[in-house]
């Protein structure tokens, strides 16, 4: 019965069994709900918008790493719908702290203004880097069907034309 179905399962009335919700492919995220016994008739998979990615399954699309704005690093590989961005060496005027454990964001570059003397990335650097934060553009992506729904992320979302 419905109550026995798991987080990513719906009750199949034909077979009388819990069935796995269809997983989405890389670069997609679930649209509408499926799980704990129920599946919306219009449940499906929608593409990640340009600035987000997903590995598929039941994962929602996540924003790409902001190499330049947050990490103060160069972009080694720009992200796409299926992959996160990969960051490269620090931007000019920034350096990587040696022998420092990675935090939840990985390696973050720090301003040469705060660097110890003779830090190799900062030798010859002028007055450091200006705080040039790129503007963050929010996604205006809507949903395929124009009605209120609850996504798997748990966020209600009303799409309007």
């Amino acid at each position: 019965e419905y109550s026995n179905c798991g987080e990513n399962e719906y009750y199949n009335q034909t077979t009388g069994l819990c069935q796995e919700c269809p997983p989405c492919g890389p670069g997609e995220e679930p649209y509408l709900s499926c799980g704990y016994g129920t599946k919306d008739e219009d449940y499906g998979c929608v593409p990640c918008p340009a600035e987000k990615f997903s590995k598929g399954g039941y994962q929602i699309c996540r924003r790409h790493k902001d190499c330049e704005g947050f990490f103060r690093a160069t972009v080694l590989t720009p992200g796409d719908m299926e992959n996160d961005a990969e960051c490269g060496p620090c931007l000019p005027g920034y350096y990587m702290l040696e022998n420092r454990p990675r935090n939840i964001y990985g390696m973050v570059c720090y301003s040469c203004l705060l660097a110890p003397p003779n830090t190799k990335e900062c030798v010859g650097a002028t007055s450091g880097a200006s705080a040039n934060f790129p503007g963050t553009s929010g996604s205006s992506t809507l949903s395929p069907f124009q009605h209120a729904h609850k996504e798997l992320s748990g966020q209600g979302h009303l799409a309007t034309a």
Epitope: E28, E41, D42, G44, C45, P47, M81, S140, T141, P144
Partner: antibody, heavy 119, light 107 residues
Amino acid sequence: EVPLEESGGGLVKPGGSRKLSCAASGFTFSDHGMHWVRQAPEKGLEWIAYISSGSSNVYYSDTVKGRFTISRDNAKNTLFLQMTSLRSEDTAMYYCARRELLRFYFDVWGQGTSVTVSS
Amino acid sequence: DIQMTQTTSSLSASLGDRVTISCRASQDIGNHLNWYQQKPDGTVKLLIYYTSRIHSGVPSRFSGSGSGTDYSLTISNLEQEDIATYFCQQGNTLPWTFGGGTKLEIK
């Protein structure tokens, strides 16, 4: 075997009614949402109606809302479009199209049936 | 409603050419962009879905790209069988809307 085959087109007088059918074969019809899309002579494609796999969700374009009704009979693998209060601007080729199982596009199309509204 | 604009209504090219057809949405459609081919006999087929994914059975000479409001379909090596009208379509929000179409002809 053609997966989707429309029928029911023909000449109708303005204000008249017509019911189009779309017979599905070769796939599990009851698993798929279905659409009607039309194309007026020498014009582009226009989506007009959608019905989900079990008929819970139905949507229409503003141009046909209140005049057209989409329905389906999963036992008979058939999609319908009941058209009433027909106008000359409803003259078009009417296609039924299948929604891909999980994704939001038309992955299989019928050959179309022609409806002419004229006195 | 979201308006889909294909500025080029007809396009003439030679066999073997690389052809690009453009499509613009009136607002961000977040990669919910599909391309269809309509042959002169009226037959409609899906080519590309979700901006860049090739539908099964579609030749690899077809490709799609774009993001936000601007999208394109490219045929890398035009063949005789590609003579058709090409429509873009947004599936981002109802009502689903199509571009006006681009008719591809042989020079």
